[in-house]
Every structure is written in C-alpha cells, then in structure tokens.
C-alpha cells in the first residue's frame, strides 16, 4: 500500500516545454491597453511631475541597460515592472548560461514612441538578450510571459516588448 505523498517510481516529470512566441505574436491575445492585459494608459510621467516618484531605478547587475541617452532613463520603471524584469533576468541566465537580459528601452522622456506608449509611464520595457542573438527572441518572449508580464509582444526582429498593469489597478486586483 502506498502512503500519502509517495511517488510511484523514481522518474520525475520532465520540465514543461516552453513554446517560443512567433514573430508579431502577443500574449495574452488581446490589445495591450485593455483590461485583460496591461490596462489603460494613465498619462505621461515627466521628470518634473509629481508621479515621477512612482518610478524606481533598477540596478540589477544581472540586467544590461542600453541607456543610449546616457541619462539612466532606461533603468526607471514601476515596481511591478521591476519585479517582473528581475524575475525574467533569472530565467534568462538559467535558460542560456553566460547570457544576460538586456533592456533597450524603459521609461522614455524623449517622445519617440507612439502617442500613448506605456514607456512614457515606466510600465513598458523593450528587451533582448545580451548577445543580441535574434534567434533567441521568440523564447525570450515566452520567458517574459512566464515571468509574469501582463502583456508580451514579439514586436520587432530587434526586440520583445513587455508591459505591466499600473500599480493602482494591480493593487486593486490583488487587494494589496
């Protein structure tokens, strides 16, 4: 008789196979700024605005930031985005030893994204792998979904776009 909690045989269940996102695929399969994904745009955050304090810098040494502007802007993001990104950084290193997560765009103050981009409020990041091997980006997108980003889009040959719900809507949903 087998007692509770006992496992028959010594074989462990193989890890679930991760299916890469296809180019131009997004998950969940709804528009980014809808309730089932990252939710509505709440307005641009400027350095001078009161809401700027909602953004927190990410100094995770396991993440490489492109920081083309040399301002540190790409490191700024909401706490929810930071948590998901840090989780993804671990997944990337586990998936590809010697490779790190790389952020090409985070919070943007330059205004070169689309009109109501979540980059303007620190809720979106564009990511690649540190080796910039584009063959990896489909799987990187899947890892981002698994890391808990609220919307992931294999947007470009050159990057994967990830975004999160606002702190307010996320807190209301979890009751925290």
């Amino acid at each position: 008789i087998i007692g509770p909690g006992r496992v028959v045989g010594s074989r462990r269940r193989p890890p679930r196979k991760l299916v890469p996102l296809a180019y131009k695929q997004f998950s969940p399969n709804v528009p980014e700024k809808t309730l089932g994904a990252s939710g509505r745009y709440e307005g641009k955050i400027a350095r001078s605005s009161e809401r700027f304090k909602e953004l927190t810098p990410n100094y995770n040494p396991d993440i490489i930031f492109k920081d083309e502007e040399n301002t540190g802007a790409d490191r700024l993001m909401t706490q929810r985005c930071k948590d998901r990104l840090n989780s993804l950084a671990i997944s990337v290193m586990n998936q590809w030893p010697g490779v790190k997560l790389r952020v090409t765009e985070g919070w943007d103050e330059d205004g070169h994204h689309s009109e109501e981009s979540l980059h303007y409020e620190g809720r979106a990041v564009d990511i690649t792998t540190s080796d910039r091997d584009r063959n990896k980006y489909g799987l990187l997108a899947r890892l981002a979904v698994e890391a808990g980003f609220d919307w992931v889009y294999y947007e470009s040959k050159a990057h994967v776009h990830c975004s999160v719900k606002s702190e307010h809507s996320a807190a209301a949903k979890t009751g925290g």
Partner: antibody
Framework: QVQLQESGPGLVKPSQTLSLTCTVS??????????WSWIRQHPGKGLEWIGS???????YYNPSLKSRVTISVDTSKNQFSLKLSSVTAADTAVYYC???????????????WGRGTLVTVSS | SYELTQPPSVSVSPGQTASITCSGE??????VSWYQQKPGQSPVLVIY???KRPSGIPERFSGSNSGNTATLTISGTQAMDEADYYC????????FGGGTKLTVL
Amino acid sequence: QVQLQESGPGLVKPSQTLSLTCTVSGGSINSGGFYWSWIRQHPGKGLEWIGSIYYSGNTYYNPSLKSRVTISVDTSKNQFSLKLSSVTAADTAVYYCARGQDSGDYDWYFDLWGRGTLVTVSS
Amino acid sequence: SYELTQPPSVSVSPGQTASITCSGEKLGYKYVSWYQQKPGQSPVLVIYHDNKRPSGIPERFSGSNSGNTATLTISGTQAMDEADYYCQAGDSSAVFGGGTKLTVL
C-alpha cells in the same frame, strides 16, 4: 522640413586631417531616435558608412576606419562634425551627411541626406 | 565583417517588373533598407524596415526579406526608375551592398 548641409574644404593634403561639418536646419539635433551619420562614396563606386552619433554623444564607427575617425556633435549649433586623420588619395570621395533612424536595435536606415561634398586628397 | 551581395546590373523593359536581390548571412534577422541614386544626386530612401515605403515613394516599389535574401521589386517599371540601387542593413555597423545598376531598355 529638416535639411542637412555639408561644409568644409574640398582639398586636403595627404597625411593631414579631413574636417567636415553638417548643419541641421528645420529641426533639432537633440531629437531622440536619430543617429547623425557620415557616409562616403568613392568616385564611380558604392556607398560606405563611416559612422554615426546619437545626440547624447554615443558614437558608432565603421571598424575599418575606426582608428582614424572622430564624429562629434554640437547641439548648441545644431551641427555634427567628421574628422578623418592621416588621409591618403584613397580617401578621395563624395562625403554625405545623413540622418539615421533606428528600425530596432541599431538597425539603422538613412531617411535624409545632404547634397554631398567632394573632398579630394592631393598634394 | 558582414557583407551584402547584389548583382552588378539588372535590365528590364518598360512596364515590366524588375527584381533586385541582396544576399547576406541570416539577412532575414536584420532589417533591410533600399536606396535609389541617380547620376550626380544624393541617394534617396525607397524602402526601409524590409517593406515599408517612405511618403512620396510610388507604390510600385516594394520589398521583402527572408532567409538570406532581401528583394526590391519595382512593378510597372518606368524610364525614370533607371538608377543605381543599394541595399543596406545594420547591426551597430551599417553595411551597404555594392549596388545594382538598373537599366530600363
């Protein structure tokens, strides 16, 4: 609309430094997303990218020319410049300044070009 | 260093379709642009992002890119399309193809 205009000497002596300036009018060189670039074309030949600079000062150079090239930006004058040192006759070419845009992660394309200026290297 | 290869010349009759190819290792993973240059003039961007047309460029210009080959297609070619065409791709170092002379017979 944005326009680019190259300026500088048309004749440079061998071993000297070639210096060109590109003036941007009708728009700010500080605009994010643009890579201000230099491209040259030897007489009767194809195009060769020399290098690009972002308004923040980050520079990107053709590996084959890197040791001799310096590109700088002067945001106050809305200009960017090229310096190519130790020139030889092989550097004789039409030099274009151009505005690069990024399709992705350094996937540049050049949507605006100056008229070009012929620089001859000769003693 | 990365190289892009184009045929030196392509000929086409007026009204016909001209195809100019550009090949490079894993080119499909990169974004390709195409430029038209007429004698004595600066290059003009005709296709970017593999298949997008800048404003002012006629609809007869189209592009595609997959595998190791990108293609510029000019449908209903006109005499005014006679020019040199250059493909270009980048990866922190912009690279141009050698150019293709398009002759409209």
